[in-house]
């Protein structure tokens, strides 16, 4: 008799794929543009990335450092009208893209939370949550919560409002902190909170260090749902050299939890390549004309257009990983087991019941390495086969679909492999 199938866990929409942050509408859309109507025209692009949610804004009225002139219920006219927002929501829903609204109050000012008027601001946030939930948004984000006094209790209250409206609504909090204890204390009192932080931001050094950070985090958070990113708002290129971007995309899409990206992460958008552009929100490179300020700065391979035409590009890799992440049970909600693979490497298995299983091997180093996969670290339910099929490599040149002998696995510098193998009873 066939073994009984394991009961599927309850899956919320944010469990099924990546979130995509557009913190600066104008930078995302490019010169002279930058409103909600224009963003509506970019939803097909977001669909092509297979992302599940769009984290938008802040877009509310905020006069720098002025509480009285900050209105969380009003859209800044530079971005459009409430009607434009409603229209964006409707279009996004048709494309199965959820919209999360950033309500960080003083986003143009020095202290995001007007430190001297916390209670006034907290009341404004509460009113805004109720208003925008009625308007049809799917969730909220608040950033820089390390600057919010009594953050845990406020977050708990805002979470109650959000979940009270519907279990299908999400609250994301962002912090600049990379300290695990601070992160855990924020999570403790807020069961379903999705928290983005700088926890992984210094993980680029070695495979061992990254493995240790990831496993510590997962062990400390138990069975709660995580999110994975390198910061609450910034681009991957702020933290990583170009040669590690593919590796991190593969890792973020295959760890258990919700991967969260900023606009431009999918093409390796890098403010350093665009002199004069702000590090935190450089202009999105749709094509070579997107950055007219400096002739010659942008080559085709840095743009959406150029990378869309190249199957070996970072954007093509992002699309493939996003697709896999949203349809494979083992990646959607499978168990995670990290195990030793030798110095410089980070490897883990994702598996769910009798579904196809995935092996991820990441070489963070700048030398080629042979992987010594220590299957003895794994529980019986997650044993390794002798061979696994190569689904994709972050580097060109490997024959995809070909079976690889796991005992003789060699990785190029900065290479990541995603391999698949069937369940064996």
């Amino acid at each position: 008799r066939a073994p009984r199938c394991r009961e599927l866990p309850a899956q919320k929409w944010w469990h099924t794929g990546a979130l995509y942050r557009i913190g600066d509408l104008q930078a995302f859309q490019g010169h002279g543009a930058g409103n909600l109507a224009g963003l509506k025209g970019r939803l097909d692009y977001l669909s092509s990335l297979k992302v599940k949610g769009l984290v938008l804004g802040p877009i509310h009225k905020n006069q720098k450092d002025d509480v009285a002139q900050t209105d969380l219920l009003q859209i800044d006219p530079n971005f459009g009208s409430k009607e434009d927002f409603d229209s964006l929501l409707q279009s996004a829903k048709k494309k199965s893209i959820r919209v999360i609204l950033d309500l960080t109050p003083n986003y143009r000012g020095e202290n995001s939370w007007f430190s001297t008027q916390v209670d006034t601001v907290a009341t404004k946030v509460k009113d805004a949550l109720e208003f925008w939930l009625q308007a049809g948004v799917d969730g909220f984000q608040v950033r820089d919560i390390e600057n919010l006094k009594d953050a845990s209790s406020f977050l708990a209250e805002w979470q109650n409002i959000t979940k009270g409206f519907s279990e299908d609504r999400l609250l994301i909090a962002g912090t600049n902190s990379s300290d695990l204890q601070q992160i855990l204390s924020l999570l403790e009192s807020n069961k379903d909170l999705l928290l983005t932080s700088s926890y992984l931001s210094d993980s680029g050094s070695t495979g061992e260090h990254t493995k240790s950070l990831v496993t510590q985090y997962l062990n400390a958070t138990g069975n709660r749902w995580c999110s994975w990113s390198l910061s609450q708002a910034r681009l991957l290129t702020s933290f990583l050299p170009a040669q590690l971007l593919r590796l991190y995309q593969l890792m973020l899409f295959t760890l258990p939890g919700t991967p969260v990206f900023s606009y431009g992460d999918e093409i390796g958008l890098d403010a350093a390549a665009l002199p004069g552009q702000p590090m935190e929100a450089p202009v999105m490179l749709w094509d070579e004309s997107s950055f007219p300020d400096i002739p010659g700065a942008v080559s085709a391979n840095m743009t959406v257009k150029g990378q869309s035409e190249d199957p070996g590009s970072l954007l093509s890799l992002f699309r493939r990983l996003s697709d896999q992440r949203s349809k494979e049970r083992s990646l959607l909600h499978g168990d995670f087991h990290a195990f030793s693979a030798g110095p410089g490497l980070f490897s883990y298995i994702r598996h769910w019941d009798q579904n196809e299983r995935f092996l991820v091997v990441l070489n963070f180093g700048d030398v080629g390495l042979s992987a010594g996969l220590q299957a003895s670290d794994l529980p019986a339910s997650a044993s390794l086969p002798a061979k696994a099929d190569l689904l994709l490599s972050t580097q060109p040149g490997r024959e995809e679909g070909s079976p690889l002998e796991l005992e003789r696995l060699k990785l190029e510098p900065h290479e990541g492999l995603l391999l698949r193998f069937p369940y064996a009873a």
Epitope: P275, G276, P278, M302
Partner: antibody, heavy 119, light 113 residues
Framework: EVQLVESGGGLVQPGRSLRLSCTTS????????MSWVRQAPGKGLEWLGF??????????EYSASVKGRFTISRDNSKSILYLQMNSLKTEDTAVYYC??????????WGQGTLVTVSS | DIVMTQSPDSLAVSLGERATINCKSS????????????LAWYQQKPGQSPKLLIY???TRESGVPDRFSGSGSGTDFTLTISSLQAEDVAVYYC?????????FGGGTKVEIK
């Protein structure tokens, strides 16, 4: 013809403030990044910061050496660039140039205005 | 900050001879995606404002005589004046625009021997 004319320099005591102006003509002011660069007597050039163009919402970047003390602003209706200098130190003594940017290299320069900080 | 180091500090060259100025950056100015070096060269004649000569390490600004050329990649760059003219007496500066703050070299003074 592009013209940049700095003014407002002079002798000022340490700790005091001064505002430099750069009056521009010959181009569409709002379309360009504008920078300030200084040169201490007999020394090299030092970039102080810039203010972006309209398309980039007139946001600013500063060198760490002046951040928090100096503020770059612009009056787009008059095509004038400003450098507000507070808490001046003797080491701020220099010729101050305004430039029109590319925005990473400096194509057009004013003639400069000398600021002397001394008690 | 990226430190730009120029050598020599000063240079005396006969009219019609070649003048070579070096500039070294503390980190690479080559951006891999577009294969561009984020470096510019300026000329400052006595009592005048600086004038842009070259950007992207080797692209001459319009109106600059072709005796001026820039070369190099990564961390090592050179400005060459192929045949020195009397009007080329000046201080020459390199400048990086790879990252904030934009920084200049200390300058190289070119004189007639």
């Amino acid at each position: 013809e592009v013209q940049l004319v700095e003014s407002g320099g002079g002798l000022v005591q340490p700790g005091r403030s001064l505002r430099l102006s750069c009056t521009t003509s010959g181009f569409t002011f709002i379309d360009y990044y504008m920078s300030w660069v200084r040169q201490a007597p007999g020394k090299g050039l030092e970039w102080l910061g810039f203010i972006r163009n309209k398309a980039n919402r007139y946001t600013t970047e500063y060198s760490a050496s002046v951040k928090g003390r100096f503020t770059i602003s612009r009056d787009n209706s008059k095509s004038i660039l400003y450098l507000q200098m507070n808490s001046l130190k003797t080491e701020d003594t220099a010729v101050y140039y305004c430039t029109r940017d590319r925005p990473a290299w400096f194509v057009y320069w004013g003639q400069g205005t000398l600021v002397t900080v001394s008690s | 900050d990226i430190v730009m180091t120029q050598s020599p500090d000063s240079l005396a060259v006969s009219l019609g001879e070649r003048a070579t100025i070096n500039c070294k950056s503390s980190q690479s100015l080559l951006y891999s995606s577009n294969q561009k070096n984020y470096l510019a060269w300026y000329q400052q004649k006595p009592g005048q404002s600086p004038k842009l000569l070259i950007y992207w390490a080797s692209t001459r600004e319009s109106g600059v005589p072709d005796r001026f050329s820039g070369s190099g990649s990564g961390t090592d760059f050179t400005l060459t004046i192929s045949s020195l003219q009397a009007e080329d007496v000046a201080v020459y500066y390199c400048q990086q625009y790879y990252s904030y703050p934009y920084t200049f070299g200390g300058g190289t003074k070119v004189e007639i021997k």
